[in-house]
């Protein structure tokens, strides 16, 4: 059986073919091969000989014993070499010769006992290694890792890992690698002897079910003393053992540890007094919390120098207290509890994120709701029923605004967005908003992209309302039930580049509402049902535009509407995906590609 | 279509087949099985994907005695500081875990329950596998 | 046990020609992908010509339009003609069998 030409010419994918050997068949210009899951079980030297310009190559579970010397001798471009899963025996000390440009080596579940004996360290440009789900019992760092001084991901989890000494890092203290990450989740870790990490700079280190209990957590935090890192992700994970108890104690030695980024990722505990417990970590830049529940909401008011706070996925009682001098950026998303939202006091605040919480907002939005002047983006997408009773006071700062698939109330009682005049970004689809006011959109001069598609019109007409968004760019009208246009209707975007209408209710087509869009690039009108054209004599569509879909209308294939179909046919090279252009009356010519259809009508005299 | 058993427990039957071309091998048990009226257990699964499970998530087609309940759609694997280990999988790797699950107080009336189980993952997104389970529901058999 | 034996290298001024020869024994080379690796001092590998059973062939951009491979299945031989030889292309010329290995190299060097 051939591979699959993914790309023709560069990528193969020949998964579970049952090859026994490397396939010759395949052009030398193959740059992306996979051949995972087949019993290739044995690599010989130049084995991929055949294959000078190969940069990524999978040999995931292919029953790999045994890896000569120059196996990948020849694959000079090789960045990426994958061997998950293969029960590796025999390993050349000369097996990886050859990969002079390689950035990534995956050896997850490859029966690796150590690095010592791992022979990889000419690798010099090798940024990524995973040699997860391995053997690997000592965390020494081997002396050929001060080659690897472009290594930025070094990954170790589920492995054997019980004790980390001072001399493991050693090879670190010689050559500080400024950025690399490290994981060592899933490791049974009982022992960090302190001084281990004294003075080792790391950019990410991620804990992740590495204690049984509550003491071996508190000593081997202890044991990080000294460390600086930039991001510390600690944790557990829904699946496996988790802690069985858990208190202010087991943070405590992060206090000798410098952190900029803290992030705790699940936790099978209920969490009562956050204060106590990240004592030591009032002042990291950015706080994050993933999957916990919190039983005090009050405690986000104490004074922490938090400039980012995340809280995703987390459970609270109710929507938490917040009032922090410092933060800048706040996520709290895909939350349960608290389905009310309450006033917050973030008087620094300029990015806020409250997605996905179906919570409802009594009243929105202004200065008052979240205690700042400096916001300049906000999304309350997703979300349950959002009252619209103010106009956006104090928030003059704000870019980026998304309410997508929320339930907005009182948009067309007054102009919502009047003080807006710095927006660039705003996104109303599916909010369940009825345009029924003119001026909804007044003040929004600065506006480039307006997303408003799943909404509705009065009398499903679309009258003038684009009047001042003079800089817009991007709009989608799709789904919007429209069935008629004001014909001056878009005449002030003379900037506008995309255009959508597709999924309304049109019944024909008119040139003339888009004669002032000089800048038009794309116009969609797939999706509705259309069978003509308004006027017996339509004009250009602006000359700049370069993509009309009108797929999936309803066209008559009719001789009185000859001259709409021929129109049709002279803007072929704008059209896109024309063979799903088809004739849907009259019935003898239903499904027949429009622009292959050859009507000639005898005319009347 | 073969079918596959994977426990009998007092108000319940659990089977399922594939519903994907590719039928690649999958094992599940729950211990102890599904009771519908209470439940409280683990789920166990031993697999090999053929992709990574980043951003994993389920398509949920659910049928109750031939109607057809509204698509669900079940977020697994968000794609970083995952809630589950197996999430961190990559294509190949043997994914051997155990998962704890309860629930309680929920009525069923009896018949035959139908579960579609799409699982998606990866970038570019791609069905990982397909399975239809089939739930027999017999309130108070004993 | 597959053996490689080269033969055809030597010391040549730049703009001259030399035809470097592989004999291969142990092995049938008909169904094979076969070809030349280069290696020199301080410099990274190269692979510099590759045939395949079907006598597809391959060049980098450094040789196209100066080298040429070739075989004889019959006589389980094949030839690399080297043209226009530049003082770059000094290095041990290694005959490849891929997947089984190579031979002990033959050294060219092309002087000025």
């Known amino acids: 059986e051939p591979c699959v030409e993914v790309v023709p010419n560069i990528t193969y994918q020949c998964m579970e073919l049952n090859f026994y050997k490397i396939p010759d068949n395949l052009p030398f210009s193959t740059k992306n091969l996979d051949l995972s899951f087949n019993p290739l079980r044995h690599l010989g030297s130049y084995s991929f000989f055949s294959f000078p310009e190969l940069q990524v190559l999978d040999l995931s579970r292919c029953e790999i014993q045994t890896i000569e010397d120059g196996a990948y001798q020849s694959l000079s471009h090789l960045s990426t070499l994958i061997l998950t899963g293969n029960p590796i025996q025999s390993l050349a000390l000369g097996a990886f010769s050859g990969l002079s440009s390689l950035q990534k080596l995956v050896a997850v579940e490859t029966n690796l006992a150590s690095l010592e004996n791992f022979p990889i360290g000419h690798l010099k440009t090798l940024k990524e290694l995973n040699v997860a789900h391995n053997l690997i019992q000592s965390f020494k760092l081997p002396e050929y890792f001060s080659n690897l001084t472009n290594l930025e991901h070094l990954d170790l989890s589920s492995n054997k890992i019980q004790s980390i000494y001072c001399t493991d890092l050693r090879v670190l203290h010689q050559m500080p690698l400024l950025n690399l990450s490290l994981d060592l989740s899933l490791n049974p870790m009982n022992f960090i002897q302190p001084g281990a990490f004294k003075e080792i700079r790391l950019h990410k280190l991620t804990l992740r079910n590495n204690f049984d209990s509550l003491n071996v957590m508190k000593t081997c935090i202890q044991g990080l003393a000294g460390l600086e890192v930039h991001r510390l992700v600690l944790g557990e994970f829904r699946n496996e053992g988790n802690l069985e108890k858990f208190d202010k104690s087991a943070l405590e030695g992060l206090c000798n540890l410098t952190i900029e980024e803290f992030r705790l990722a699940y936790l099978d505990y209920y969490l009562d007094d956050i204060i106590d417990l990240f004592n030591c970590l009032t002042n990291v830049s950015s706080f994050s919390l993933v999957s916990v529940t919190i039983e005090r909401v009050k405690d986000f008011s104490y004074n922490f120098g938090w400039q980012h706070l995340e809280l995703v996925n987390c459970k609270f009682g109710q929507f938490p207290t917040l009032k922090l001098k410092s933060l800048k950026r706040l996520t709290f998303t895909s939350n349960k509890g608290g389905n009310a939202f309450s006033e917050v006091d973030l008087p620094s605040l300029e990015f806020l994120d409250l997605s996905r919480n179906g919570l409802s907002f009594k009243g929105c939005c202004s200065q008052s709701d979240f205690g700042t002047t400096s916001l300049k983006y906000l999304d309350l997408s997703f979300n349950g029923v959002i009252t619209m009773s103010s106009n956006f006071l104090g928030l003059e700062q704000l870019e980026h605004l998304d309410f997508q698939h929320s339930n907005l109330k009182q948009m067309s009682e007054f102009s919502v967005f009047l003080s807006l005049r710095n927006l660039i970004y705003l996104d109303i689809s599916h909010t369940h908003t009825r345009v029924a006011f003119n001026g909804i959109f007044n003040g929004l001069s600065s506006l480039e992209v307006l997303k408003m598609a799943g909404n509705s019109f009065q009398e499903n007409f679309l009258p003038d309302i684009f009047t001042e968004l003079r800089n817009l760019t991007f709009l989608d009208l799709s789904q919007c039930q429209l069935e008629q246009l004001s014909p001056t209707a878009f005449n002030s975007l003379s900037s506008l580049q995309v255009l959508n209408m597709s999924h309304n209710n049109f019944f024909s087509l008119d040139t003339f509402p888009y004669k002032c869009l000089n800048s038009l690039q794309v116009l969609d009108y797939s999706l509705n049902h259309i069978m003509t054209s308004k006027k017996q004599e339509l004009q250009h569509f602006p000359s700049s535009l370069a993509f009309l879909n009108l797929t999936q209308n309803d066209f008559a294939c009719t001789c009185e509407h000859q001259s709409f179909l021929q129109w049709i046919k002279d803007q072929r090279q704008l059209l896109v995906e024309v063979e799903r252009m088809e004739c849907a009356t009259p019935s003898d010519k239903q499904g027949m590609p429009v622009l292959s259809l050859n009507i000639t009508c005898q005319m009347n005299k | 279509q073969k079918q596959y058993w994977v426990c009998n427990s007092s108000d319940a039957s659990i089977s399922y087949t594939y519903c994907d071309k590719m039928q690649y091998p999958i094992s599940i048990n729950v211990n102890p099985c599904i009771e519908l009226k209470r439940s409280k257990g683990l789920l166990h699964i031993f697999y090999i994907p053929r992709r990574d499970l980043k951003q994993l998530y389920f398509n949920l087609y659910i049928t109750v005695n031939t109607m057809n309940l509204p698509k669900r759609k079940e977020v697994i694997c968000r794609g970083s500081d995952d809630d589950y280990s197996f999430c961190r999988a990559l294509k190949g790797e043997t994914v051997n875990t155990t998962i704890s699950f309860s629930f309680k107080g929920i009525k069923f009336s009896k018949g035959k329950y139908k579960c579609v189980v799409e699982a998606i993952s990866g970038s570019p997104e791609e069905m990982l596998f397909c399975l239809e389970f089939v739930i027999l529901h017999q309130p108070n058999s004993n | 046990e597959v053996q490689l034996v080269e033969s055809g290298g030597g010391l040549v001024q730049a703009g001259g020609s030399l035809r470097l020869s592989c004999v291969a024994s142990?092995?049938?080379?008909?169904?094979?992908?076969m070809g030349w690796y280069r290696q020199a001092p301080g410099k990274q590998g190269e692979s510099v010509a590759i045939?395949?059973?079907?006598?597809?062939?391959y060049y980098p951009d450094s040789v196209k339009g100066r080298f040429a491979i070739s075989r004889d299945n019959a006589k389980n031989t094949v030839y690399l003609q080297m043209n226009s030889l530049k003082l770059e292309d000094t290095g041990v010329y290694y005959c490849?069998?891929?997947?089984?290995?190579r031979g002990q190299g033959t050294q060219v060097t092309v002087s000025s």
């Open positions: 045939i395949k059973s079907d006598g597809s062939t």
């Open positions: 142990g092995i049938t080379i008909s169904t094979e992908v």
């Open positions: 490849i069998i891929a997947g089984r290995g």
